[in-house]
């Protein structure tokens, strides 16, 4: 026999159900709430310190570089690469043609000076891009030198120095007591490298990793 | 954690949330249909009181497991 | 569309979903009580054979909407 | 030691050119370093004219236009100094120099330099 | 072109006296400058490069010092042989420029 208050038991059963399911819905939508809030917040709290990043990271430049010029790399308009803007750029590197005339240590040390080294040349094709920007009446410094007049030839950047990867004019290098290298044009050979004296001024090439903002 | 890899992992689990909660719903709804059927047989005609005006008010068997 | 904004406008199509899901599965829920609750007390007691052991294969009751 | 003499005649007319050799003995010039002129007005202000490297490679200084020629005779050690269309504001000392010691840091070698006047 | 300004162009002092010029350059020079005595009608003899080493054979009562733009050339207790002009140069960038010079006297 069913006792005579069932029916409000009942009732005040299907009340209590109808909260908890109904509490389970608002938690489950809070926590939807919340994983679409943080979706939506944090990458814009994620924009704005990668912003914060990025203009911190132009301020380190800027003392050197006023203007960066950028392209975007890829799809994702996250990604941008920049050269300082009278730079030119060439894969993963910028590069700049100094003209003013300064011995090989100077030369190295106003590379610096903007972020860069003396130019590391690794491939015919980077030789290639960068002679197109220099003068035939013109040498310039490269970030290889032989500091012990031995032969043991090194890049500015620790580059191992590859014998196969070279470009020196024939006959060259020819002179234990020059050890600094340069690019130049010889008319016979069109464009190659020469060993001379370091203290002897000449133009130079600078180059940096492109700055990824 | 970055931006994208965030926005990645927030899809995941919506995502999961999503089936998870599309399966209880079917799985419920099919019960649901069992039980009538069920139920039908058995009463010789007890849902006539529920008529196709009152399907949009139909409530949960008692079911102690809560929704997952 | 860059891969980040497709990854946020599918956050929200799953977030959406899952609201709608969510209240869809609660309703049901409810609707599933009550007609429990409604058909016992006219059929008296004519859900004795749906146990508590056949509680989990419980079915939708007679609806023609399709699941959203 | 190195040393370093300058000689060319000491009076010049205006138009005309101005003619010096600077003759080297002690080092070869041919072996390393740059040969500079550089020149001093009455007013005791110095300036750089350009110079000729080891190599035979040049460099004059802009504010010297296209007047200024510097050349050499590797064979008696020898560099030279022209400079055409010469006016009165080109009087001054000239000195010959060895640049690229204490690794470019300083000129250390200067001939005793020879006044040259230009005058009518 | 870097340009140098030498200060002062006429200094009079002592013997004994100590004494300092300077010479600031248009741009930063990395301490490449030099510095160099000359009396009359004497070719100039280099004091100082680098900004602060002394050439050879020169005196320790010389010293030279500075960074960047603003350099200085120091005299310790003056010596009769230490009149006459100086002059400081850059040697950064071609061309290296001059100071304009300064007379020091006998007061």
């Known amino acids: 026999m069913v006792p005579e208050e069932e029916p409000q038991d009942r009732e005040k059963g299907l009340w209590w159900f109808q909260l908890k399911v109904w509490s389970m819905a608002v938690v489950s939508i809070l926590l939807l709430s919340v994983c679409f809030t943080v979706s939506s917040v944090v990458p814009h709290n994620f924009m704005y310190s990668k912003t914060v990043k990025r203009l911190s990271k132009l301020r380190e430049y800027q003392q050197y570089h006023p203007s960066l010029t950028c392209v975007m790399e890829g799809k994702d308009i996250e990604d941008w690469s920049c050269c300082p803007t009278p730079w030119t750029s060439f894969q993963s590197s910028c590069y700049f043609i100094s003209t003013g005339m300064q011995s090989w240590t100077k030369s190295q040390k106003n590379c610096s000076v903007m972020g860069a080294d003396l130019v590391v040349i690794n491939t015919r094709e980077e030789q290639d891009f960068i002679i197109q920007n220099l003068k035939r009446n013109s040498s310039y410094f490269l970030g290889l030198s032989d500091p012990g007049g031995r032969r043991h030839w090194q890049w500015v950047d620790q580059t191992p120095y590859n014998e196969n990867v070279t470009f020196w004019h024939s006959g060259e290098p020819n002179n234990l007591d020059e050890r600094c290298a340069i690019i130049n044009f010889r008319s016979s050979e069109e464009w190659g490298w020469n060993d001379i004296h370091c203290h002897v001024p000449q133009k130079s090439i600078c180059k940096m990793k492109k700055i990824y903002i | 954690l970055g931006e994208p890899q965030l926005c990645y992992i927030l899809d995941a689990i919506l995502f999961l949330y999503g089936i998870v909660l599309t399966l209880l719903y079917c799985r419920l709804k099919i019960q649901v249909r069992k039980a009538a059927i069920t139920s039908y047989e058995k009463s010789d005609g007890v849902y006539t009181g529920l008529s196709t005006r009152n399907q949009e008010t139909y409530e949960t068997l008692k079911h102690e497991k809560p929704p997952q | 569309l860059g891969e980040p904004q497709l990854c946020y406008i599918l956050d929200a199509i799953l977030f959406l979903y899952g609201i709608v899901l969510t209240l869809l599965y609660c309703r049901l829920k409810i609707q599933v009580r009550k007609a429990a609750i409604t058909s016992y007390e006219k059929s008296d007691g004519v859900y004795t054979g749906l146990s508590t052991r056949n509680q989990e294969t419980y079915e939708t009751l007679k609806h023609e909407k399709p699941p959203q | 030691d190195v040393q370093l003499q300058e000689s060319g005649p000491g009076l010049v007319k205006p138009s005309q050119s101005l003619s010096l050799t600077c003759s080297v003995t002690?080092?070869?010039?041919?072996?390393?370093?740059?040969w500079n002129w550089i020149r001093q007005f009455p007013g005791n202000k110095l300036e750089c004219m350009g110079y000729?490297?080891?190599?035979?490679?040049?460099y004059y200084n802009p504010s010297l236009k296209n007047r200024i020629s510097i050349t050499r005779d590797t064979s008696k050690n020898q560099f030279f100094l022209s400079l055409n269309s010469v006016t009165t504001e080109d009087t001054a000392t000239y000195f010959c120099?060895?640049?690229?010691?204490?690794?470019?840091?300083?000129?250390?070698?200067w001939g005793q330099g020879t006044l040259v006047t230009v005058s009518a | 072109d870097i340009q140098m300004t030498q200060s002062p162009a006429s200094l009079s002092a002592s013997v004994g006296e100590t004494v300092t010029i300077t010479c600031r350059a248009s741009?930063?020079?990395?301490?490449?400058l030099a510095w160099y005595q000359q009396k009359q009608g004497k070719s100039p003899q280099l004091l100082v490069y680098?900004?602060?080493t002394l050439a050879d054979g020169v005196p320790s009562r010389f010293s030279g010092s500075g960074s960047e733009t603003q350099y200085s050339l120091k005299i310790n207790s003056l010596q009769p042989e230490d009149f006459g002009n100086y002059f400081c140069?850059?040697?950064?960038?071609?061309?290296?420029?001059f100071g304009g010079g300064t007379k020091l006297e006998i007061k």
């Open positions: 002690g080092y070869s010039i041919t072996s390393a370093y740059y």
């Open positions: 680098n900004a602060k």
């Open positions: 140069q850059h040697f950064w960038i071609i061309p290296y420029t």
């Open positions: 000729i490297s080891y190599d035979g490679s040049n």
């Open positions: 741009g930063n020079i990395h301490n490449y």
């Open positions: 120099v060895r640049g690229g010691d204490y690794d470019d840091g300083g000129f250390a070698y």
